[in-house]
């Protein structure tokens, strides 16, 4: 089920998610799940042919983020 934004944001800001802080939003299946069920994207080695792990996720709150703010993963920092 789609929801309208909770607040006006810049074009590049992550969209809010309907999850409580205890869960994360899975962009692939578009619903909330336990954060441990998601896999963070990792850099793919050159020439690797195996499928990448599940990605596309939005933790509902990052450390220091306000309630209701979504935090996008930062693959380059993992």
């Amino acid at each position: 089920m789609r929801r309208g934004p909770r607040s006006l944001r810049g074009r590049d800001a992550p969209a809010p998610t309907p999850c409580v802080p205890a869960e994360c939003f899975d962009l692939l299946v578009r619903h909330c799940v336990a954060c441990g069920l998601l896999r963070t994207p990792r850099p793919k080695p050159a020439g690797a042919s195996s499928p990448a792990p599940r990605t596309a996720l939005q933790p509902q709150e990052s450390v220091g983020a306000g309630a209701g703010e979504a935090a996008l993963p930062l693959p380059g920092l993992l």
Epitope: G36, L37, T40, S62, P73
Partner: antibody, heavy 118, light 113 residues
Framework: EVQLVESGGGLVQPGGSLRLSCAAS????????VSWVRQAPGKGLEWVGF??????????EYNPSVKGRFTISRDTSKNTLYLQMNSLRAEDTAVYYC?????????WGQGTLVTVSS | DIQMTQSPSSLSASVGDRVTITCKSS????????????LAWYQQKPGKAPKLLIY???TRESGVPSRFSGSGSGTDFTLTISSLQPEDFATYYC?????????FGQGTKVEIK
Amino acid sequence: EVQLVESGGGLVQPGGSLRLSCAASGFPVTGSYVSWVRQAPGKGLEWVGFIRDKANGYTTEYNPSVKGRFTISRDTSKNTLYLQMNSLRAEDTAVYYCAQVRRALDYWGQGTLVTVSS
Amino acid sequence: DIQMTQSPSSLSASVGDRVTITCKSSQSLLYSSNQNNYLAWYQQKPGKAPKLLIYWASTRESGVPSRFSGSGSGTDFTLTISSLQPEDFATYYCQQYYTYPYTFGQGTKVEIK
């Protein structure tokens, strides 16, 4: 103020059914996740499951120990949640709590005792 | 399922003592994308419902006294009561909500010495 009040506990025979209620006040159940947790007499806590909010289609998650026997639902007009328990076993004897889920299990009711015995 | 192991299972302490309870999980509870550990601590007094003290391993719930603190990351966590008060004698539980089913430690009973 958030308040949760459980009711419906009692004595039931093995194989029987019981429906527990969790009356919520201070918040709308349409916009909240609510969990059920149980505690056998003198034992620790065991998570039963939870129901998500309206934005998530009231989807549910269950502990494998109760999946297929227990069902969580809600009546938004009464701002009440339910735990339907079928095929009850002696090991289901416990105090059953409902709790609002936000950052963890944030607010808890006082619990209702379910005894499964012949 | 993730197993949560608390130690000790019980302890005796006096008012004013510093008390430390540990909790180990069978797998990491750290979600690397936001650096949150999905671990909570609860206090339960006899005949009462549990009360949330700490979430995300180290964030104190609103209204919880500052003498309660949580620390740790990954698989090893600690709840510390810096100066035990008479109202702190209770059973304490850790709980993971990193994945389903949510699981609790077996509890640590803090008794009066």
